[in-house]
Amino acid sequence: FGISGKHFITVTTFTSAGNIGEDGTLSCTFEPDIKLNGIVIQWLKEGIKGLVHEFKEGKDDLSQQHEMFRGRTAVFADQVVVGNASLRLKNVQLTDAGTYTCYIHTSKGKGNANLEYKTGAFSMPEINVDYNASSESLRCEAPRWFPQPTVAWASQVDQGANFSEVSNTSFELNSENVTMKVVSVLYNVTINNTYSCMIENDIAKATGDIKVTDSEVKRRSQLELLNSG
């Protein structure tokens, strides 16, 4: 869609990532227009004939929707008048990745913007002390990743140390044959130290921290999506 007509309206999108099997959001905002019936939102995907989603006259019009999106798309209907054209995507599929266009037509004019949507799998790691091992070790597990991530260990006391020789990482394919469970074991750990297990692919980076002392074990996990914005 090229922009025709005298008036351009600003449409803003954000690159984002979808977690396979979960709900996703493709973000798009535009200059608000209080006349809901005059707003048309069209979502398109590069390489796909037909629409991803169309919302006009205050309701969905799915007559031209492409088969691969049937039953899985919705806009935030009550937020359209305030300029939110974001698309909800139910049960994100690996094949949903690609370039999308958010096209807006209101009584003020027309505009569009593209966004890159990445899909994969990412999950929080959990670190536990593995008391079964002959020497004290740490076990870092994360249930769902795709594409295959890299795993690295770090320690607060031995900053900059390379733990690849004293760790073992395995990837186990999950039942749906796409995502994988990540398990990494770090051997010969010492108490009164904080260890970090970092899992990263081109979509997300997750870190699990564990602090082991004589009296307690403290854990913290965080997950960040990469290249969004």
């Epitope: 049937r70 039953g71 899985r72 919705a74 209907a77």
Partner: antibody, heavy 121, light 107 residues
Amino acid sequence: QVQLQQSGAELMKPGASVKMSCKATGYTFSSYWIEWVKQRPGHGLEWIGEILPGTSITTYNAKFKVKATFTADTSSNTAYMQLSSLTSEDSAVYFCARYYFGSSSFYFDYWGQGTSLTVSS
Amino acid sequence: QAVVTQESALTTSPGDTVTLTCRSSTGAVTTSNYANWVQEKPDHLFTGLIGGTNNRVPGVPARFSGSLIGDKAALTITGAQTEDEAMYFCALWYNNHWVFGGGTKLE
């Protein structure tokens, strides 16, 4: 009018498998999700999972991932749920329900009458 | 997995207004939980009432309404009728799965 007609009651032996059906009439079968729900006395309702007919897209409650398998046949407008390795814990009434996902709302509207499953040796 | 909690039973009289609530163990219920309300009458007769927090399922009487009250989802029956005596279940969506509440018996 919209109807979801479920198959009849089943009496099965432990370790066996059962496949129950949910036939949809009165609407475009492939435009709505079919949800499967388990009801046991004293346990309320438990969501098993969902399938979008005409696609291979399914979502399972982690608890039922090994137990249940969903399929759908768009030529007969029928959704199926197979339960494997049956135990007494699987004795329950199983419901299919239609779920609409759209911009104006997201709702379970029509439900089947339920299929009663008894697992006993 | 989250736990969804409802009042186990409520009593009302014809013509009264009654509110049933639905709480999530993970924190405040939001519009992203797509709160659904379902009615069960004897012999396993289920009917969807409300979806997406506050949208009535087509054909459901206007006396049924859904909302968020504080950190909970709520179903309000304004001017309850004798045929509203039933079990009411709420269901909340958690990004990739539904969790049902234990149900409220309305008498």
